[in-house]
Interface confidence: medium
């Protein structure tokens, strides 16, 4: 449905408040270094222009595409070349190349200061002084640090952020009320950002077909009572929404997401019995709720899959007529029967099935050739089951911190060329799989664990892509989206790695470690652990454990000392010498 003015259409659909918020997010995700005030000025100019188009859709420039309007606006920034270097060259291009150019310059790890939370009184005063600016600043700071954050979902986070301040700044104990809410929003926000980053990587690196396959599997698990045609419609719509958001088309994305939520709620009887509560909520909550809704119960008496996909004489005929539709039906039927499998496992099974049909449908006796295809699934299913069992046992034995340390050592030995901050961040997140998933019963462990690991390993892939240092990482990240985790799991110690030279400065600590939070202190220790492994990749677990135990005792001792700095200087030298001796450095 063509509109005379796209900007007027979106302004009217979304309303002024959401329009302004989404334009701010879009601009902050593109120009991540620009000051807040500059972005607000640009957003206000775009909004005023949109209002003129709402009043008269035939007014000058109102017929231009959103990419043209927004790109023109971004290219007016005076310090573009100075701040962004070659990104300024994007402005010499025409649409759609200009937008593609901006997208390519999005930075997953921008050089921005850590968001340090000030005292609660500071935040409450700022909130009361100017609520609108306060909330815009939240959108801006999150969007520029997470350039692929799912924009309509960020509006939902901002709504909760506002609600937290509205409630807690009036409470008797503001901090007790507010801080846990902010912690929860921060943790959920990081998880949401990482999940969306995987969706965008899937679309951008592996194409629409890969994303659609993921969506068929996940929606079939979630809505096992829905017909294949219904699931296909939802997959098509969902793919459009995420393609738009990942492509920077945030107004279209938010609009289409609202339409999809509306459709799902109007047709919930043919989709899922679990949607009722979600569909009673306001728009932002509704969309979030649908995205997180639990799996519906599987229909009773589902027939065996073998009849249609192995035993039937028409398998090759059906496959040849419409390959992707037939494979989609296979994936749908398999996924709705297996909420206990991870999406990536289901996709591996579908890939195996596809490869078998490609080979067998060209054979002399196709049926004889593919008759045992389901037997090939057994090792694929057992591999993640065994891995999860072993790692959950290790997690239960060690606890989260020491489990993270075991993964730090494991991954540093696999890919020692990767930067220490990236190894620490990724391994800490990999280690969180324990507390997140091992508490679940067997039937929920694999979808929880392996799909979460896919999200975390994608963080490693996108960070590594910015500064590639390891061929092994590049290989695991680019060869197959669904086999990333098995690829990393299969990596052994990198025998080609030349150990890093020992640098005492890396292991020099100061009294400031004593004032750090427990989490920050853990990160300091884990950074030292990674560096140790980089210096001595052949160190045994026992050797590393002894050094880390000594290190923990050293920090505890010096933090209790009267003259902390002297203690760190003197005891630190002894610790470094003892560690060098213990590890043979």
């Amino acid at each position: 449905d063509a509109h005379k003015s796209e900007v007027a259409h979106r302004f009217k659909d979304l309303g002024e408040e959401n329009f302004k918020a989404l334009v701010l997010i879009a601009f902050a995700q593109y120009l991540q270094q620009c000051p807040f005030e500059d972005h607000v000025k640009l957003v206000n100019e775009v909004t005023e222009f949109a209002k003129t188009c709402v009043a008269d859709e035939s007014a000058e420039n109102c017929d231009k595409s959103l990419h043209t309007l927004f790109g023109d606006k971004l290219c007016t920034v005076a310090t573009l070349r100075e701040t962004y270097g070659e990104m300024a060259d994007c402005c010499a291009k025409q649409e759609p190349e200009r937008n593609e150019c901006f997208l390519q310059h999005k930075d997953d790890n921008p050089n921005l200061p850590r968001l340090v939370r000030p005292e609660v009184d500071v935040m409450c005063t700022a909130f009361h002084d100017n609520e609108e600016t306060f909330l815009k600043k939240y959108l801006y700071e999150i969007a520029r640090r997470h350039p692929y954050f799912y924009a309509p979902e960020l509006l939902f986070f901002a709504k909760r952020y506002k609600a937290a301040f509205t409630e807690c700044c009036q409470a008797a104990d503001k901090a007790a009320c507010l801080l846990p809410k902010l912690d929860e929003l921060r943790d959920e926000g990081k998880a949401s950002s990482a999940k969306q980053r995987l969706k965008c990587a899937s679309l951008q690196k592996f194409g629409e077909r890969a994303f659609k396959a993921w969506a068929v599997a996940r929606l079939s698990q979630r809505f096992p009572k829905a017909e294949f045609a219904e699931v296909s419609k939802l997959v098509t719509d969902l793919t459009k929404v995420h393609t738009e958001c990942c492509h920077g088309d945030l107004l279209e994305c938010a609009d289409d997401r609202a339409d999809l939520a509306k459709y799902i709620c109007e047709n919930q009887d043919s989709i899922s019995s679990k949607l009722k509560e979600c569909c009673e909520k306001p728009l932002l909550e509704k969309s979030h709720c649908i995205a997180e809704v639990e799996n519906d119960e599987m229909p009773a008496d589902l027939p065996s899959l073998a009849a249609d996909f192995v035993e039937s004489k028409d398998v090759c005929k059906n496959y040849a007529e419409a390959k992707d539709v037939f494979l989609g039906m296979f994936l749908y039927e398999y996924a709705r029967r297996h909420p206990d499998y991870s999406v990536v496992l289901l996709l591996r099974l579908a890939k195996t099935y596809e490869t078998t049909l490609e080979k067998c449908c060209a054979a002399a006796d196709p049926h004889e050739c593919y008759a045992k295809v389901f037997d090939e699934f057994k090792p694929l299913v057992e591999e993640p089951q065994n891995l999860i069992k072993q790692n959950c046992e290790l997690f239960e034995q060690l606890g989260e911190y020491k489990f993270q340390n075991a993964l730090l050592v494991r991954y540093t030995k696999k890919v020692p060329q990767v930067s220490t901050p990236t190894l620490v961040e990724v391994s800490r997140n990999l280690g969180k799989v324990g507390s997140k998933c091992c508490k679940h019963p067997e039937a929920k462990r694999m979808p929880c664990a392996e799909d979460y690991l896919s999200v975390v390993l994608n963080q490693l892939c996108v960070l590594h892509e910015k500064t590639p240092v390891s061929d092994r990482v590049t290989k695991c990240c680019t060869e197959s989206l669904v086999n990333r985790r098995p690829c990393f799991s299969a990596l052994e110690v990198d025998e080609t790695y030349v150990p890093k030279e020992f640098n005492a400065e890396t292991f020099t600590f100061h009294a400031d470690i004593c004032t750090l939070s427990e989490k920050e202190r853990q990160i300091k220790k884990q950074t030292a652990l990674v560096e140790l492994v980089k210096h001595k990749p052949k160190a045994t677990k026992e050797q590393l454990k002894a050094v880390m135990d000594d290190f923990a005792a050293f920090v505890e001792k010096c933090c209790k000392a009267d003259d902390k700095e002297t203690c760190f200087a003197e005891e630190g030298k002894k610790l470094v010498a003892a560690s060098q001796a213990a590890l043979g450095l």
Epitope: P113, V116, P118, D121, V122, T125, A126, D512
Partner: nanobody, 115 residues
Framework: QVQLVESGGGSVQPGGSLRLSCAAS??????MGWFRQAPGKQRESVAA???????KYADSVKGRFTISRDNGKNTVYLQMNSLKSEDTAVYYC???????????WGRGTQVSVSS
């Protein structure tokens, strides 16, 4: 509304010193930061002081500038020594520390360094 009022700027020759003050209306805020904006440039962080008294400085001012505060007077200071021509800018303070500002910007105070 929280008001941030910067003062102490002026014109000095290279090698000279200035002490900037920033008063936050109403109460003492933590953390605090000093920022500056030179003509045609983006505003940048110069120095910050945390709730625990820890400090951070831009590489270009390390060893020459010192940030401190007087909690009793709700004031944060920036002692600027060995000034250089490239320190010429409007200096602003804000609540929030390094690179982060929680309140609207004040008018700032102009520092000009030239011979």
């Amino acid at each position: 509304q929280v008001q941030l009022v910067e003062s102490g700027g002026g014109s000095v020759q290279p090698g000279g010193s200035l002490r900037l003050s920033c008063a936050a209306s109403g109460r003492n805020f933590n953390p605090m930061g000093w920022f500056r904006q030179a003509p045609g440039k983006q505003r940048e962080s110069v120095a910050a002081i945390g709730t625990d008294g820890s400090t951070k400085y831009a590489d270009s001012v390390k060893g020459r500038f010192t940030i401190s505060r007087d909690n009793g007077k709700n004031t944060v200071y920036l002692q600027m020594n060995s000034l250089k021509s490239e320190d010429t800018a409007v200096y602003y303070c804000n609540v929030g520390g390094w690179g982060i500002s929680w309140f609207p910007w004040g008018r700032g105070t102009q520092v000009s360094v030239s011979s």
